[in-house]
Amino acid sequence: QEEDLPRPSISAEPGTVIPLGSHVTFVCRGPVGVQTFRLERDSRSTYNDTEDVSQASPSESEARFRIDSVREGNAGLYRCIYYKPPKWSEQSDYLELLVKESSGGPDSPDTEPGSSAGPTQRPSDNSHNEHAPASQGLKAEHLY
């Protein structure tokens, strides 16, 4: 029972410009019925999976990926992909996370929302097993 899967979306809370040491949560969204969401970092070389999916609306699922204490090394491009049996979706647009030194002064700019688009690439369908591993040839490293 094949169906066309809509591309997921990605956002960040409270935004995409995060002070060093603060927290950020990436929110991935897709259709109802998603089994696994994956947050990929910089061309799929590292990723985190979750099957802890919840409803975002009557027509959407979501998953949340939290980084408790942002480091400079967390800056970069992130995107989402999901698995709804029997296949993977395309990737979302990229979201760029910027990490700034926390000056803490009254003139510090507020955290800004925003995103930057990037290319998408479909993973090979035969790369999937029940636990949604990385595509073949990639090391299963964690984002944080």
Partner: antibody, heavy 117, light 107 residues
Framework: EVQLVESGGGLVQPKGSLKLSCAAS????????MNWVRQAPGKGLEWVAR??????????YYADSVKDRFTISRDDSESMVYLQMNNLKTEDTAMYYC????????WGQGTLVTVSA | DIQMTQSPASQSASLGESVTITCLAS??????LAWYQQKPGKSPQLLIY???SLADGVPSRFSGSGSGTKFSFKISSLQAEDFVSYYC?????????FGAGTKLELK
């Protein structure tokens, strides 16, 4: 192979306590939400409790019928989920199933809890 | 809480026939609905998720339809092993409520 094995059921008196355990294997336990569902003899299914993963701060949810009496918890290092049941009532008599994730694809075989004087 | 009203409570049918079970949600749940089969003495088995998607390994004679508040579950060409109990469940919001069940009986 995904396995969910419940244990800890038995006979207990009204107002008594019991702790159920569910041992999970064959999947990435720590990224899944886990649930308990029960079924009284000859009756339908009733969702009891749910615990989310670390990425969702181990949030817990309960059916109104068990709120303030039952507590769901988990140990990711041991791939275990628990249901602590206090102040048990005769209407809590049921088969208790451990169930994985949001869409209830995987169920354990169940453990029977009988509350009777 | 969202109530799930499942009907009929029981239904008699013959081998090879088709049957339809309905489930009504007390408020809109989009397509956050699942259908389960339960054989006597066994754990339930997921058949349909997201209202219309067939779970892995489930025969294509099972199907689901609907969205919002009204949902249907159909078994076409009943086989001997299909004469068991079926439940709907909403997963839109906690508590994750089930319908009361439908028992299929051989006519």
């Amino acid at each position: 192979e995904v396995q969910l094995v419940e244990s800890g059921g038995g006979l207990v008196q009204p107002k008594g306590s019991l702790k159920l355990s569910c041992a999970a294997s064959g999947f990435s336990f720590n990224i899944n939400a886990m649930n308990w569902v029960r079924q009284a003899p000859g009756k339908g299914l009733e969702w009891v409790a749910r615990i989310r993963s670390k990425s969702n701060n181990y949030e817990t949810y309960y059916a109104d019928s068990v709120k303030d009496r039952f507590t769901i918890s988990r140990d990711d290092s041991e791939s275990m989920v628990y249901l602590q049941m206090n102040n048990l009532k005769t209407e809590d008599t049921a088969m208790y199933y451990c169930v994985r994730s949001l869409w209830f694809v995987y169920w354990g075989q169940g453990t029977l809890v009988t509350v009777s004087a | 809480d969202i109530q799930m009203t499942q009907s009929p409570a029981s239904q008699s049918a013959s081998l090879g026939e088709s049957v339809t079970i309905t489930c009504l949600a007390s408020q809109t749940i989009g397509t956050w609905l699942a259908w389960y089969q339960q054989k006597p003495g066994k754990s339930p088995q997921l058949l349909i998720y997201a209202a219309t998607s067939l779970a892995d390994g489930v025969p294509s004679r099972f199907s689901g339809s609907g969205s919002g508040t009204k949902f249907s579950f159909k078994i076409s060409s009943l086989q001997a092993e299909d004469f068991v109990s079926y439940y709907c469940q909403q997963l839109y919001s906690t508590p994750l409520t089930f319908g009361a069940g439908t028992k299929l009986e051989l006519k």
